[in-house]
Structure formats: structure tokens, C-alpha cells
Interface confidence: low
């Protein structure tokens, strides 16, 4: 339904508060370096304009598209050229090219200072003094650091952020109340950002078909009682929502997400028996709850898949008539029967099935050709099962920190050209799969582990894309979305890598390490470990463990010393010499 004024339409649908919040998120995700006050000024100008259009949809410029209105507003920023360089060239383009240009300049790793959490009393004072500004600042800081954060979900995080301060700033022990809540929001926020980043990468790099296939598999696992037509409708709507959010159309995205939640709740009888509680919640909580809802029980007595997809004489006829619909049905039927498989495994099976039909339906005897297609699935299923079993055993033996270290060594040897901070960040996240997934029973391990690894490896891919340094990473990231993890798993030590020159400065430490949190101290040690492997890629596990042992001992010793700085200087020289000797450098 066409509206005379798109901006008025969205303002009325979303309400002023959500409208302003979403425009702020959109602007902060595009212009990530701009000061908070500049963004607030732009948002207020857009909001005032929207109100004039609500009052009179025929008023001047009210008929313009949101991209045109928002793009024009962004292009009024005086310091665009000096702050953003070539991004300023986007302003010379017309829509839709201008918006595409802004999208291409989104930076997954912006050069912004780390967010430092002030004292609790300071935060509570700021919250009470100006609640609105305090919450806007939260949206701004998250959005500019996570330019693909799922905007309607960020509104949900902001609501929880506000609730935490409202409750805890009145508590007897403010810190004990507030800090765990903020830690939880931070960790959930990072996870949410990374999950959404994969959805956007899927849409932008591999196209709508790839995203729809992912959505069919996931929704079929989640809603196994829903009919194929119902799942297809949900997939179409969900694809629209994520296409909009990934494309910077945040007002449309939030509006359509609300409509989708409304539809799901109105039709829950034909979708899932698990939605009742979600559908009783307010809008933001409802949408979040639906997105996280547990899988419904599988219908009893589902027939064998072979009947329709292998034994039927109409397989090639059905395939030829509507290839994507037939493959979608295959994926739906397979996924609803296998909540124990990862989505990426289901997609690999569907791809194998598609490849087999392409080949066999052109053969002299198609049925004879594809009769054994399900046998081809066995190794595809066993590979992630075995990998997860081995890695969970290793995790249980080592614990999270040492498991991360094992992965750091493994991945640095595979792709040593990748920057050390990226290797540390990605390997630490890969290592978290242990505590996240290995506690689950067998039936839940694979969907937990492999789909989580897809999210983490996508972080590697988007960070690497910004400054490509390894052909092997580029190859694994671009060839196939569903085979990224097997591609990285299959990489061996890079024999072409020329070891880095030894630089004692890299291994010089100071007394400040003693005051770091345990997590930050781990990161320091893990950074040193990556650098060691880059210097000596052929170092054995034993050699690396010995050096890391001595490093841990050195830190412990000097942090206990009276004159810490002198200890770090003197013992540090000994450590470097001992490490060089141990590694034969």
C-alpha cells in the first residue's frame, strides 16, 4: 500500500520514541566517527521534519524516499571529507547508488576507543540527571561500534539497560545489583551483533537465495508442526525484514518485524505450541522471545523421506517443474526431522541432493542414478559429529583458557598472515564453543556448536575482508557459505609462510600487566603466544607450552616483586633469551 509520505507513515506506525531511536541508530551506523551531539542534532531535525509531514503529507519534500531524506541529512555534515575521506564521494551520487555507497563504507572494526565503564555512582548520577540523553548515548555507542546490529533488537537491549539502572540505582548495594546485569547485556549484545553480522553477510555476499535456504532450515527445525506453505510465508517475511535492516532501512525493518511478530502470534496454532508465553509479552520482548523460542516437538509418525525424494518416480518431474520449491520442500522435510543437525549441515545435504538431481535427471536412468543419494549424506553427517566429539574431549581435558590456546596455535599455523589481534579475538571466541555447547547432550551439541562456529568464522571473514592478507582466508570465506567451517578445519600448516623476524619489543612487558583483569591478562598472554607461533611456526606443542609456562611464571614472579618495573625489565631479558633458546630462534 503506497503512502503519500513514507516518513509520516513510519513515524505514525512506530511512534516518536522508537522513530527517534531508530534514526539515531541508522545515522550512528553510517557515520561511525561523528560526535554524539552532532547525531542528536541531525535526529532532532529529521524528527521535526517528520512531524510536519504527519500534519500534512503533501508538505514540501514529504514525498521523498527515506534514503533520500536521510542521505541528504548525512551529507550536510560539515566535516565529512576530513573525517571520512572517500566516503564523502558518496554524496555526489544519486539514490539508490548513494545509499549503496554508504553501506560499503560501514566499518566492522572502527578505530574507536574501548568503552570504559565508569564508577557505578557516576553512572547512576548521569542516569538520574538526564535519563533520555543517557539512553541515547547507549544506542549511539553500541550502534557506531556495531554497524550491522539488528536495530529493533537494539531497542530491546536499551529497554533492558534502562530497567537495570532504574532498579539498581535505588538498591542498597548498587554495584552488586548493576554490574552483573551490565556484564550480561554486554555479552549478549556481542553475541547478538555477531549473529546479525552473519545474516547480513549471507544476504550481501551470497544473495537472497542463500539466506532463504538458511531460514527454511532453521524455521523448519523450530516449527516442525507448521506446514511447508506456512514456513515459506514466514521465510519470505523474515527475509524482507533482514534485507531491510542489513540495507540500512531501519524504520521499515522495525515496522515489518512488528508486523511479523503480530502475524506469528495471531497464527500460532498453525505454527508452534511454544509461542504462547512469547505472545503475551509487549512488542520488543515478544519479538525477541519469538526469535529465541525453543524448537517445538516433532509431529509423531512422520513418514520416511525416501518415499518422496528417492523412491518416487516423479522426483525429476517435480524437480524440473519448480526446482527451488522442490528443494525447499526437501530442506523443510529434512530439517523438521533433524533438530539434532546444524543448519549448515542441513544446507550441505540439500546442496548434495541438488547436485545429484542436476546430474541424474539428465542421465539415461535417473532413478538408478540417484537411488543411493542418501548414502552420500553419511560422511557429511559424520564429519561434524567427529570433530565436535574430539574438540569437546579436548575442552573437557584442558578447560576454556587452555582450549583457546590450543585453537590459537592451530589457527595461527593455518593462517599466520592474519593480524595478531584478529587471531586472538577469533580464537578466543572459537574456544568459547566449549563452555557454550559441550555441556549439552549429544542431540543438541551439533546445532549449538557448528552454527556458533559459523558466526565466529564470519567475524574472521568480515575483519579479513577489510584488509585481505591471506588467499587461504579469502578462499574459505568466499567459495561457499555453508562450507566455511569445513574449509578452515581442512587447512593444514601454511608451508609458504616466511616466519616473522624476532622482535624483543613484542615480548617486553611492564608492571601494568599486574593490575589487569584476569581476562585482559589472558589476552596479553595469548597475544604473546600468537607472536611466538608467527616467529616459529614449526615449534612443537611442548616447546610452546614450556615457553608459555615460563612466561606465566615470569608474570607471577614480577607481580609479587617489591620493585615490579625493575623485575619486568631484568627478568624480561632473561625470559626473551630463554624463549629464544627454547625455540631455537
Amino acid at each position: 500500500d503506497a503512502h503519500k509520505s513514507e516518513v509520516a507513515h513510519r513515524f505514525k506506525d512506530l511512534g516518536e520514541e522508537n522513530f527517534k531511536a531508530l534514526v539515531l541508530i541508522a545515522f550512528a551506523q553510517y557515520l561511525q566517527q561523528c560526535p554524539f551531539e552532532d547525531h542528536v542534532k541531525l535526529v532532532n531535525e529529521v524528527t521535526e521534519f517528520a512531524k510536519t509531514c504527519v500534519a500534512d503529507e503533501s508538505a514540501e519534500n514529504c514525498d521523498k524516499s527515506l534514503h533520500t531524506l536521510f542521505g541528504d541529512k548525512l551529507c550536510t555534515v560539515a566535516t565529512l571529507r576530513e573525517t571520512y575521506g572517500e566516503m564523502a564521494d558518496c554524496c555526489a551520487k544519486q539514490e539508490p547508488e548513494r545509499n549503496e555507497c554508504f553501506l560499503q563504507h560501514k566499518d566492522d572494526n572502527p578505530n574507536l576507543p574501548r568503552l570504559v565503564r565508569p564508577e557505578v555512582d557516576v553512572m547512576c548520577t548521569a542516569f538520574h540527571d538526564n535519563e533520555e540523553t543517557f539512553l541515547k548515548k547507549y544506542l549511539y555507542e553500541i550502534a557506531r561500534r556495531h554497524p550491522y546490529f539488528y536495530a529493533p533488537e537494539l531497542l530491546f537491549f536499551a529497554k533492558r539497560y534502562k530497567a537495570a539502572f532504574t532498579e539498581c540505582c535505588q538498591a542498597a548495594d548498587k554495584a552488586a545489583c548493576l554490574l552483573p546485569k551490565l556484564d550480561e547485556l554486554r555479552d549478549e549484545g556481542k553475541a547478538s551483533s555477531a549473529k546479525q553480522r552473519l545474516k547480513c553477510a549471507s544476504l550481501q555476499k551470497f544473495g537472497e537465495r542463500a539466506f532463504k535456504a538458511w531460514a527454511v532450515a532453521r524455521l523448519s527445525q523450530r516449527f516442525p508442526k507448521a506446514e511447508f506453505a506456512e514456513v515459506s510465508k514466514l521465510v519470505t517475511d523474515l527475509t524482507k525484514v533482514h534485507t531491510e535492516c542489513c540495507h540500512g532501512d531501519l524504520l521499515e525493518c522495525a515496522d515489518d518485524r512488528a508486523d511479523l511478530a503480530k502475524y506469528i502470534c495471531e497464527n500460532q496454532d498453525s505454527i508452534s505450541s511454544k509461542l504462547k508465553e512469547c505472545c503475551e509479552k509487549p512488542l520488543l520482548e515478544k519479538s525477541h522471545c519469538i526469535a529465541e523460542v525453543e524448537n517445538d516437538e516433532m509431529p509423531a509418525d512422520l513418514p520416511s523421506l525416501a518415499a518422496d525424494f528417492v523412491e518416487s518416480k516423479d522426483v525429476c518431474k517435480n524437480y524440473a517443474e519448480a526446482k527451488d520449491v522442490f528443494l525447499g520442500m526437501f530442506l523443510y522435510e529434512y530439517a523438521r526431522r533433524h533438530p539434532d543437525y546444524s543448519v549448515v549441515l542441513l544446507l550441505r545435504l540439500a546442496k548434495t541432493y541438488e547436485t545429484t538431481l542436476e546430474k541424474c535427471c539428465a542421465a539415461a536412468d535417473p532413478h538408478e542414478c540417484y537411488a543411493k543419494v542418501f548414502d552420500e549424506f553419511k560422511p557429511l553427517v559424520e564429519e561434524p559429529q567427529n570433530l565436535i566429539k574430539q574438540n569437546c574431549e579436548l575442552f573437557e581435558q584442558l578447560g576454556e583458557y587452555k582450549f583457546q590456546n590450543a585453537l590459537l596455535v592451530r589457527y595461527t599455523k593455518k593462517v599466520p598472515q592474519v593480524s595478531t589481534p584478529t587471531l586472538v579475538e577469533v580464537s578466543r571466541n572459537l574456544g568459547k564453543v566449549g563452555s557454550k555447547c559441550c555441556k549439552h547432550p549429544e542431540a543438541k551439541r551439533m546445532p549449538c556448536a557448528e552454527d556458533y562456529l559459523s558466526v565466529v568464522l564470519n567475524q574472521l571473514c568480515v575483519l579479513h575482508e577489510k584488509t585481505p592478507v591471506s588467499d587461504r582466508v579469502t578462499k574459505c570465506c568466499t567459495e561457499s557459505l555453508v562450507n566455511r567451517r569445513p574449509c578452515f578445519s581442512a587447512l593444514e600448516v601454511d608451508e609458504t609462510y616466511v616466519p616473522k623476524e624476532f622482535n624483543a619489543e613484542t615480548f617486553t612487558f611492564h608492571a601494568d600487566i599486574c593490575t589487569l583483569s584476569e581476562k585482559e591478562r589472558q589476552i596479553k598472554k595469548q597475544t604473546a603466544l600468537v607472536e611466538l607461533v608467527k616467529h616459529k611456526p614449526k615449534a612443537t606443542k611442548e616447546q610452546l607450552k614450556a615457553v608459555m609456562d615460563d612466561f606465566a611464571a615470569f608474570v607471577e614472579k614480577c607481580c609479587k616483586a617489591d620493585d615490579k618495573e625493575t623485575c619486568f625489565a631484568e627478568e624480561g631479558k632473561k625470559l626473551v633469551a630463554a624463549s629464544q633458546a627454547a625455540l631455537g630462534l
Epitope: E542, K545, A546, D549, D550, A552, A553, L575, A578
Partner: nanobody, 123 residues
Amino acid sequence: DVQLVESGGGVVQPGGSLRLSCAASGLTFSSYAMGWFRQAPGKERERVVSISRGGGYTYYADSVKGRFTISRDNSENTVYLQMNSLRPEDTALYYCAAARYWATGSEYEFDYWGQGTLVTVSS
């Protein structure tokens, strides 16, 4: 089978010295950090000293600094604890332990334990 066998314990007067030894077998000795723990009657077990795999790094509890010295001989698969200026409060069962990684203090980080050797400091 991994075995850690302590020896050298006994009764000694305050101010006296003892040298404890711990002979290891069944493991690649040079791949393990070694430590000495002690447990006095009615008290929790505490780490006294430890030494890294190559011997380059040592840890001493504040209560024994300057009096006890740990050393290791990787060719002999043995770790030693030289105890000087002994005090009555050093009376305890002394355990030798091996850690796959340099351990920062918690006993759960040590993989193998000996049976212990008793040290009694008394006049």
C-alpha cells in the same frame, strides 16, 4: 604408571636443615612444572614452592622466602627442596606434585601427587 616418591623427611630441631627429594617415574619429567605442598594437622594444604619445567622460574610462599630453595635435575627426574632455618610452624606432611602447565597456585592444577613425607620441627 606415574609415580612421585618423596624422601628426606624426619625430625629436626628449630633452626636445623633438611633436604627433601622427589623422584618421578612414568612421565616425561621435563614436560612438567613441579611443586611442593604441605599440610599441617588440622589445616588446609598449601603450596610452598614450585618450579617451571626448565627450572628458570620459581615461586615461593611468603612464609618460606629466603629459607627454602627448590631445584630440579631433569636428567635424574628429581626435584629437591632444601629447607634451612626450620621453625616449629614448618611441621607438616610435605607433598610433591607435578603440573602439566605452570600452575598459579590452586592444587587442582596439579595432575600427579606423591604420598607425602613427614617433617617435624621440635626441640
